[in-house]
Amino acid sequence: EPTMYGEILSPNYPQAYPSEVEKSWDIEVPEGYGIHLYFTHLDIELSENCAYDSVQIISGDTEEGRLCGQRSSNNPHSPIVEEFQVPYNKLQVIFKSDFSNEERFTGFAAYYVATDINECTDFVDVPCSHFCNNFIGGYFCSCPPEYFLHDDMKNCGVNCSGDVFTALIGEIASPNYPKPYPENSRCEYQIRLEKGFQVVVTLRREDFDVEAADSAGNCLDSLVFVAGDRQFGPYCGHGFPGPLNIETKSNALDIIFQTDLTGQKKGWKLRYHGDPMPCPKEDTPNSVWEPDKAKYVFRDVVQITCLDGFEVVEGRVGATSFYSTCQSNGKWSNSKLKCQPVDCGIPESIENGKVEDPESTLFGSVIRYTCEEPYYYMENGGGGEYHCAGNGSWVNEVLGPELPKCVPVCGVPREPFEEKQRIIGGSDADIKNFPWQVFFDNPWAGGALINEYWVLTAAHVVEGNREPTMYVGSTSVQTSRLAKSKMLTPEHVFIHPGWKLLEVPEGRTNFDNDIALVRLKDPVKMGPTVSPICLPGTSSDYNLMDGDLGLISGWGRTEKRDRAVRLKAARLPVAPLRKCKEVKVEKPTADAEAYVFTPNMICAGGEKGMDSCKGDSGGAFAVQDPNDKTKFYAAGLVSWGPQCGTYGLYTRVKNYVDWIMKTMQENSTPRED
């Protein structure tokens, strides 16, 4: 417990103190007092620096004194032989004696009393920033007019904080400006504008005079601007050292002016105003901004339109433009939206063709369609090259978005027919020589494939069986071989409207318009043994002349057997129609004059006994295309004849091309179109 006074005596005082003693006393007087310690008796063994025996006086970490030897008072009116005055309220006294004393020493007697200290003058550090007032046991600080005492009860400052400025324009100055600003103060000013406006501060160099920085460059007095997580300053010195126009990019600004105890100057004055928050003109790739301005501010709206071939995608849908607003935080809305290349997706596959796997399906990518050569070619042109267009479609320069169409190559046998000599008078053939050859099993007859869905034959072949079974792709028509060949299923039979239907077909003498089409249920896949024959062109180039050679093929009657098992073929010339008329009809069913000969018929044969016969009906009379020697076209169809092995009559296909085309067109599926 602190005491106001006390006595301290060495051990055994006034008797001699013992050897090897160490004793300490902790003196404490109340706060606000100092200590006056004085000795009235001192008799301690003398040694150099009081090394043997001593009394030590310690204040905090400081040794105030170390005593030994004998002392007497210099003043006859005072018993004090040694004294100490400290301005602190704590003191320690330590007495030490060593192991031997050659004489008898009586030690010391000391007293302490609490004394008032003058905190205002007794310390190096002045406790008050302005006025210091001492009283017994303490002191208090006070301030000049217009200042107030801070919570630490020592420092005075001016009341310059708490102002909030919300107007869009204003002026703020340091206290007393342009008179010297108060020392030892912290002034805080707040500017709070509506969201969407940024505080812009403007100063003039001459409106700023604040105590300069120290030698280390630290401002002793400073002005700081804080906007969110951005700080401008600290600033100090004569003339404003910072930018004269500060765009804070924030609607909230704190201005902090901090001063120390010394060096007052005139201070500062600034103006501020609210600017609509600017948004940066962002570089958004692959797009254009409308309107295009040098500067965009709060509430500005731009339309961002993607360049051709680019789009904004969300989920499975896209858009080519969007709107973006400059927001109150200085950022654009919809900044997540980016114009990315249009994706045309995986290209559609096509029948009888393929498209290479694209490296990319994005805008500008190129793909190529090819047909399954040599059996198909690209009918609608365009070269098969498509690029990914801006609208998200694969587009061809010629066809646009229409897909290429792979159609069968006509009239090109995989292997040319070579007569091995001596149908009648013909040779063995391979189906690869006549890949268009179609076999009808009931009645036993032939036909010609003219495209994926259509077979051309003679009307008399199908008049009695409107659901014929047909086969393609086999040289042999043995039952076991046919099982492995391709069977064609008819969907509908179209007989030429000019073909006269009879009650008794066997008695027919008029074979005019002996032509029919069979529509197939499913498309035929082309290959080396199956491919169509061409139709004649409509130009005069396709008018047959006597002597023009044509090929016939079929499984009909031969010299040796009623029906052939393996395909036979023969090359025979076109002859004048009169040659056919002159031949006596074998087994006539009517008067010879009753047989009708028309311009719709071609007469051919008469050489080396080569002719078509029963069972070859409907097969093609194939003639080399005058405009493309690699191809054959169906100039005729095996129709009838007066006598096998002489001349035969063939339906003149050229006269029916319009009917064929019209029939096919009117009865096609959308896929064929």
């Epitope: 969300e314 858009a319 969007f322 997540k336």
Partner: antibody, heavy 116, light 107 residues
Framework: QVQLVQSGAEVKKPGASVKVSCKAS????????MHWVRQAPEQGLEWMGW????????IYAQKFQGRVTITADTSTNTAYMELSSLRSEDTAVYYC?????????WGQGTLVTVSS | DIQMTQSPKSLSASVGDRVTITCRAS??????LDWYQQKPGQSPKLLIY???YRYSGVPSRFSGSGSGTDFTLTISSLQPEDFATYYC?????????FGQGTKLEIK
């Protein structure tokens, strides 16, 4: 597939706060804006604000400024909406929604009832 | 803030009818307008975006038109599942605002 699952119904006293969560799956919320829309009983839809979870930027409707806080935790792919100083007229179904071009996906809604 | 006004507030119609709902913006919103359908107890569903684009999976009987301040949602032939409340919303500038809704009821 894309889903937004919101926290369950809440009953609060006037003056209290409520925090509604919206857990996203099937997409990364950093790639979208997350909006909050409310609908008082038998009333229309009212947009409250949005957050860009990528950088925590927020925009609030003036009506809710100072009372609403929208946050997002990208580590859990979840958006939150906190509304303070609740009053009886804040009783509503609160929806979260995802957008870039439009509000294509919505949460199932969270009913918040404010009653003394 | 941009105000969105829908009309009518409610309307009664029969299955098969052609129905038109209009939405007017207090200022130009170009084509930044979306239409939503909401059924009782359900969240809203997007029908039309950017004024005229049908969202994926939305039946072709729904169509949108307009730009600037006047917009229309048309249902060409009402189906039983179309009876609901329809909202327009502008996404031209924040705050994004909704119309007050049009309740489509069965006659």
């Amino acid at each position: 597939q894309v889903q937004l699952v919101q926290s369950g119904a809440e009953v609060k006293k006037p003056g209290a706060s409520v925090k509604v969560s919206c857990k996203a799956s099937g997409f990364n919320i950093k790639e979208y804006y997350m909006h909050w829309v409310r609908q008082a009983p038998e009333q229309g839809l009212e947009w409250m604000g949005w957050i860009d979870p990528e950088n925590a930027d927020t925009i609030y409707a003036q009506k809710f400024q100072g009372r609403v806080t929208i946050t997002a935790d990208t580590s859990t792919n979840t958006a939150y909406m906190e509304l303070s100083s609740l009053r009886s007229e804040d009783t509503a179904v609160y929806y979260c929604a995802r957008s870039r071009l439009f509000f294509a996906y919505w949460g199932q809604g969270t009913l918040v009832t404010v009653s003394s | 803030d941009i105000q969105m006004t829908q009309s009518p507030k409610s309307l009664s119609a029969s299955v098969g009818d052609r129905v038109t709902i209009t939405c007017r913006a207090s200022q130009d919103v170009r084509t930044a307008l979306d239409w939503y359908q909401q059924k009782p107890g359900q969240s809203p569903k997007l029908l039309i975006y950017s004024a005229s684009y049908r969202y994926s999976g939305v039946p072709s009987r729904f169509s949108g038109s307009g730009s600037g301040t006047d917009f229309t949602l048309t249902i060409s032939s009402l189906q039983p599942e179309d009876f609901a409340t329809y909202y327009c919303q502008q996404q031209y500038t924040t705050p994004y605002t909704f119309g007050q809704g049009t309740k489509l009821e069965i006659k």
